[in-house]
C-alpha cells in the first residue's frame, strides 16, 4: 500500500494505491483511492506512466478527457465514473499488454487540494493448474497442466506423506510456447506416485504462485487448486 500526500500543507489530500499485477490479454485494475469531494465537477483524476509522455487517462468535470492520452492506451482505459464521487479513482485497463508493466502515478485534484501516489504494476501470465491421473502411462503417473504462464515459472512437486521429499528426479516439466508467442503452456509429469496420498503441483514466477492438489485414494480422486498474486502491496 502506498499512501501519497499533496505537497503544500493544508492543500494536500491523501491518495492511496495498491501495487498489483495484470494478466496479459485480460483486463486489469490499477487501484487508487482518495479523500472524496462533495462535487464531482471539482475532481480531476490523472493517471500517468513513467516513461510514457502522453497521459494514461484523465477524468475531469465529470467525464473522460482523453485528448492528451498516449496512443499506447487508446481505447483501453476507463475509470469507474459512478464511484469517483466516493473517492475511487481506480483505473480499468483492458487487454493488458506486457509493455503495460511499470510505475504509474495516480494524481488527484479536488477542492480540498492535490495529492498523488505511485503504483508498481507488473504484467505477465498466470493460470490455474489442473492435476490429473495419467492413465495412459505405464506406471502410476500424475500430469499437471496450466495453459498460460509468463515469464517462465518454476514447477515443484510436493506430497503430504513424503513431506520435504525432492521430486525433481521423478518428474519432468516442459514449456510449450502458445500461438501468440509470449505465454507458455506448462506441463509437468510426476512418476511413481503412490495411492492414498495428496500431491501438490506448485507453479510460481515473480508475479503469481498457483497450486494444484490431487488426492488419490482407491475409491476416489479429489482435486483442488488456488492462485495467489505476489507482491500486492499498498502505497
Amino acid at each position: 500500500l502506498i499512501i501519497g500526500f499533496g505537497i503544500s500543507g493544508r492543500h494536500s489530500i491523501t491518495v492511496t494505491t495498491v501495487a498489483s499485477a495484470g494478466n496479459i490479454g485480460e483486463d486489469g485494475i490499477l487501484s487508487c483511492t482518495f479523500e472524496p469531494d462533495i462535487k464531482l465537477s471539482d475532481i480531476v483524476i490523472q493517471w500517468l506512466k513513467e516513461g510514457v509522455l502522453g497521459l494514461v487517462h484523465e477524468f475531469k468535470e465529470g467525464k473522460d478527457e482523453l485528448s492528451e492520452q498516449d496512443e499506447m492506451f487508446r481505447g483501453r482505459t476507463a475509470v469507474f465514473a459512478d464511484q469517483v464521487i466516493v473517492g475511487n479513482a481506480s483505473l480499468r485497463l483492458k487487454n493488458v499488454q506486457l509493455t503495460d508493466a511499470g510505475t504509474y502515478k495516480c494524481y488527484i485534484i479536488t477542492s480540498k487540494g492535490k495529492g498523488n501516489a505511485n503504483l508498481e504494476y507488473k504484467t505477465g501470465a498466470f493460470s490455474m493448474p489442473e492435476v490429473n491421473v495419467d492413465y495412459n502411462a505405464s506406471s502410476e503417473t500424475l500430469r499437471c497442466e496450466a495453459p498460460r504462464w509468463f515469464p517462465q515459472p518454476t514447477v515443484v512437486w510436493a506430497s503430504q506423506v513424503d513431506q520435504g521429499a525432492n521430486f525433481s528426479e521423478v518428474s519432468n516439466t516442459s514449456f510449450e510456447l502458445n500461438s501468440e508467442n509470449v505465454t507458455m503452456k506448462v506441463v509437468s509429469v510426476l512418476y511413481n506416485v503412490t495411492i492414498n496420498n495428496t500431491y501438490s503441483c506448485m507453479i510460481e514466477n515473480d508475479i503469481a504462485k498457483a497450486t494444484g492438489d490431487i488426492k488419490v485414494t482407491e475409491s476416489e480422486i479429489k482435486r483442488r487448486s488456488h492462485l495467489q498474486l505476489l507482491n500486492s502491496k499498498a502505497s
Partner: antibody
Framework: QVQLVQSGAEVKKPGASVKVSCKAS????????MYWVRQAPGQGLEWMGR????????VYAQKLQGRVTMTRDTSTSTVYMELSSLRSEDTAVYYC?????????WGQGTLVTVSS | DIQMTQSPSSLSASVGDRVTITCRAS??????VNWYQQKPGKAPKLLIY??SRLHTVPSRFSGSGSGTDFTLTISSLQPEDFATYYC?????????FGGGTKVEIK
C-alpha cells in the same frame, strides 16, 4: 518561446546516408515526443516516425523500417534522423515536430536532394 | 494503417466565402483528428486539434466531427487563408495525413 531549429540543406548521391538534426529550445525536451515528417516536392505530408526523448524508444513507419534511425542527445536537446541507402524518391523536405497527439511547433524544414 | 481521405483536393473561392473541407477516416478514430495549414515554402502550422479545439487561430476557423467523418470550416475566407490544408489522424501510429486541399483565389 518553443523553437525547433533544423540543420541545413543536403545534397546526397543514391546509396548514401543523410543525418538531419533538430535542436529544441523553450520547453522541457523530455516532456513530449519528437516526430519526423517529410514532404516530397509538390506532394503531401508523410509521417516517418517518432522518438521518445526520455527513453530513446522509437516507432518507425513500416515503409522506412531498416533505413531510418532516430536518436537523441538530451545534453543538447537535439534529435537526429538518419536515412540510409538513399534513392531519388527520398528527395524531400524533412521536418521535425513536437507533440503527443498533435504537432506544434514544427521545425523550419531541411531539404534533402538525392541526385547522381 | 488508417487512411485519411480528404476532399476536395483543390477549390477556388473568393474572399468572404464560406469554405468547407472534409476528411474521412478508414476506421473509427474518435476525435483524434488535427488540421494544419501550410503556405508555400513554409512548415505546416497547427490550426485545430482533437477535431474541434482551436489552437492559436482566428475564430473563423472551426472543426467538427467524430468517428470517421470530419470537417474543417472557414466561415469567411480572408486573403491570408489561401494555402493548403491537411487533416491528420492521431488515433494510432502511423499518424497518417490526408492528401491535402489547396484553397486558391477565384
Amino acid at each position: 518561446q518553443v523553437q525547433l531549429v533544423q540543420s541545413g540543406a543536403e545534397v546526397k548521391k543514391p546509396g548514401a546516408s543523410v543525418k538531419v538534426s533538430c535542436k529544441a529550445s523553450g520547453y522541457t525536451f523530455t516532456a513530449q515526443y519528437m516526430y519526423w515528417v517529410r514532404q516530397a516536392p509538390g506532394q503531401g505530408l508523410e509521417w516517418m516516425g517518432r522518438i521518445n526523448p526520455t527513453s530513446g524508444n522509437t516507432v518507425y513507419a513500416q515503409k522506412l523500417q531498416g533505413r531510418v534511425t532516430m536518436t537523441r542527445d538530451t545534453s543538447t536537446s537535439t534529435v537526429y534522423m538518419e536515412l540510409s541507402s538513399l534513392r531519388s524518391e527520398d528527395t524531400a523536405v524533412y521536418y521535425c515536430a513536437r507533440g503527443i497527439n498533435w504537432f506544434d511547433p514544427w521545425g523550419q524544414g531541411t531539404l534533402v536532394t538525392v541526385s547522381s | 494503417d488508417i487512411q485519411m481521405t480528404q476532399s476536395p483536393s483543390s477549390l477556388s473561392a473568393s474572399v468572404g466565402d464560406r469554405v468547407t473541407i472534409t476528411c474521412r477516416a478508414s476506421q473509427n478514430i474518435d476525435t483524434y483528428v488535427n488540421w494544419y495549414q501550410q503556405k508555400p515554402g513554409k512548415a505546416p502550422k497547427l490550426l485545430i486539434y482533437a477535431a474541434s479545439r482551436l489552437h492559436t487561430v482566428p475564430s473563423r476557423f472551426s472543426g467538427s466531427g467524430s468517428g470517421t467523418d470530419f470537417t474543417l470550416t472557414i466561415s469567411s475566407l480572408q486573403p491570408e487563408d489561401f494555402a493548403t490544408y491537411y487533416c491528420q489522424q492521431s488515433y494510432t501510429s502511423p499518424f497518417t495525413f490526408g492528401g491535402g486541399t489547396k484553397v486558391e483565389i477565384k
